[in-house]
């Protein structure tokens, strides 16, 4: 065993090349200089090393850089990245978007691993905020990335980043996340005129308060039913029948098919049946004629 730790004569690696795939693990350990490996990391990816051999190469880099790898090495890790643990990655200082892209490419097509999550966290923290280019990159690899962030993390997203968000990126966001993102979107798109603005803001409306929905109803936006169904129930309830009619435009007819689902069901219960009848859709369940509507929340506040 002791003899095996010395590199056999003539086997000392002069460069990282294909001949190394025939080396046993102990030979790689003994014959490959860590500094040489670090400077020629870009070649490793092109060589079909076994997972066991990659373990050896990783071990050599760990010994050379006990405090964490420099970015020049990280950028060229390639498949060796899959061997890294979150603990390894926490030692890194990744500042280049190109480095991030290179490592995400290695994991492409797979679920977000703990390693990738740690890498992204380190990168975003290093930048101070989730800027547009970073968000563009992350959502390209992981469409659900934005919705994996907590509301607190989302609060640090600058409005300019919102321009990079596609409707599908918000599919898995819950109302708490949209509550944070919607004001950012409002800021981001404020220089747009009515119709252009609506196209952009539409995906974020699950975070819109009643006041904004009322304002939108004055803009002839013709909101589709799919968007309407994603609105916050508490934001929809105070809308009048006339406001909902204006908001949906020709899509108002779709209310009939959704009358048993929230928020339509709850909204119907709050409207006078007379008002609902004016839509001519046969919506039932409104407040009957002659009934007095008491706002219990107001009553509680007074008592």
């Amino acid at each position: 065993e002791v003899e095996k730790t010395a590199c056999p004569s003539g086997k000392k690696a002069r460069e990282i090349d294909e001949s190394l795939i025939f080396y046993k693990k102990w030979e790689l350990e003994a014959c490959v200089d860590a500094a040489l490996l670090a400077t020629q990391m870009d070649r490793v990816n092109a060589i079909p090393f076994t997972y066991e051999q990659l373990d050896v190469l990783k071990h050599k880099l760990d010994e050379l850089y006990p405090q964490g790898y420099p970015e020049s090495v990280i950028q060229h890790l390639g498949y060796l990245f899959l061997k890294m643990s979150p603990e390894d990655i926490r030692k890194w200082n990744v500042t280049s978007l190109e480095t991030l892209k290179a490592l995400l490419e290695v994991n492409k097509g797979h679920e977000m691993s703990p390693q990738v999550a740690t890498l992204i966290d380190r990168f975003v923290k290093g930048r101070g905020q989730l800027d547009k280019d970073t968000l563009d990159t992350l959502t390209a690899f992981y469409p659900g990335y934005l919705c994996s962030l907590s509301p607190e993390e989302l609060s640090s997203v600058p409005p300019s980043s919102i321009w990079a968000v596609r409707p599908q990126d918000l599919d898995t966001c819950d109302p708490r996340q949209l509550d944070v993102l919607y004001p950012k979107a409002r800021l981001a798109f404020q220089n747009m005129n009515g119709s252009e603005y609506f196209v952009k803001i539409q995906s974020f409306l699950g975070g819109a308060p009643t006041e904004d929905l009322k304002a939108l109803s004055q803009q002839n936006v013709s909101m589709d039913l799919a968007t309407f169904m994603k609105l916050r129930t508490d934001a929809v309830l105070p809308l009048t029948v006339a406001e909902v009619q204006k908001l949906l435009g020709p899509h108002v007819e779709g209310l009939k098919a959704e009358e048993r689902h929230r928020p339509v069901r709850d909204w119907i219960l709050r409207q006078r049946q007379d008002d609902l009848d004016t839509l001519g859709l046969g919506l039932q369940g409104g407040i009957p004629n002659g009934y007095l509507v008491l706002d219990l929340s107001m009553q509680e506040a007074l008592s």
Partner: antibody, heavy 122, light 106 residues
Framework: EVQLVQSGAEVKKPGASVKVSCKAS????????VQWVRQAPGQGLEWMGI????????TYAQKFQGRVTMTRDTSTSTVYMELSSLRSEDTAVYYC???????????????WGQGTLVTVSS | SYELTQPPSVSVSPGQTASITCSGD??????ASWYQQKPGQSPVLVIY???RRPSGIPERFSGSNSGNTATLTISGTQAMDEADYYC?????????FGTGTKVTVL
């Protein structure tokens, strides 16, 4: 007439923090965005950031990122702006302003507080 | 970073028209607002979204915005209009205020 009433003048040492409050007299205060703007003596206006009606979403000017925190207490209709690591250049009048005008893409500052003078001096 | 440039001062006789310009790269692609500030007082919004007047603001205040320049026009200027005026626009992640213009009514 809706009014925004701000806390009184403050004198702080460099490195300290200051927390300015902004309280509305109207009952609908919690429906509106509140922005903060400052004005150094004899200088122009400088935007610091904005907080949404529920208080869950804030956006800060890049210049103040990491030093400013805006919070909201909806139960008392009060918004707070805290600025840390104060330096002499932070000596200014700090204003809160409410956006309550029309429209969905509107952020005009319609109602302003009276301003709070913060002096940073050793 | 985005900058909005205004003339430091504009002088106008009572009853005449005062025009204050605000220049910035492609400012016409953004909405411009204007604020009036009198000495020792908080600012007041006089124009928003280029040319809209908040309720309570006199009709003599009007605005326009195209190309690289937004303009605030005060027609039939009165002594009470003497103040500092600031333009404002949203760019990227921040509101930018103009350098300010002192309007003096002679």
């Amino acid at each position: 007439e809706v009014q925004l009433v701000q806390s009184g003048a403050e004198v702080k040492k460099p490195g300290a923090s200051v927390k300015v409050s902004c309280k509305a007299s109207g009952d609908t205060f919690n429906r509106y965005y509140v922005q903060w703007v400052r004005q150094a003596p004899g200088q122009g206006l400088e935007w610091m950031g904005i907080i949404n009606p529920s208080g869950v979403s804030t956006t800060y000017a890049q210049k103040f990122q990491g030093r400013v925190t805006m919070t909201r207490d909806t139960s008392t209709s009060t918004v707070y702006m805290e600025l840390s690591s104060l330096r002499s250049e932070d000596t200014a009048v700090y204003y809160c302003a409410e956006t309550r005008g029309p429209g969905f893409n509107y952020f005009g500052m319609d109602v302003w507080g009276q301003g709070t003078l913060v002096t940073v001096s050793s | 970073s985005y900058e909005l440039t205004q003339p430091p001062s504009v002088s106008v006789s009572p009853g005449q028209t005062a025009s204050i310009t605000c220049s910035g790269d492609k400012l016409g692609d953004k909405y411009a607002s204007w604020y009036q500030q009198k000495p020792g007082q908080s600012p007041v919004l006089v124009i928003y979204q280029d040319n809209r007047r908040p309720s309570g603001i006199p009709e003599r205040f009007s605005g326009s915005n195209s190309g690289n320049t937004a303009t605030l026009t005060i027609s039939g200027t009165q002594a009470m209009d003497e103040a500092d005026y600031y333009c404002q626009a949203w760019d990227s992640d921040t509101y930018v205020f103009g350098t300010g213009t002192k309007v003096t009514v002679l």
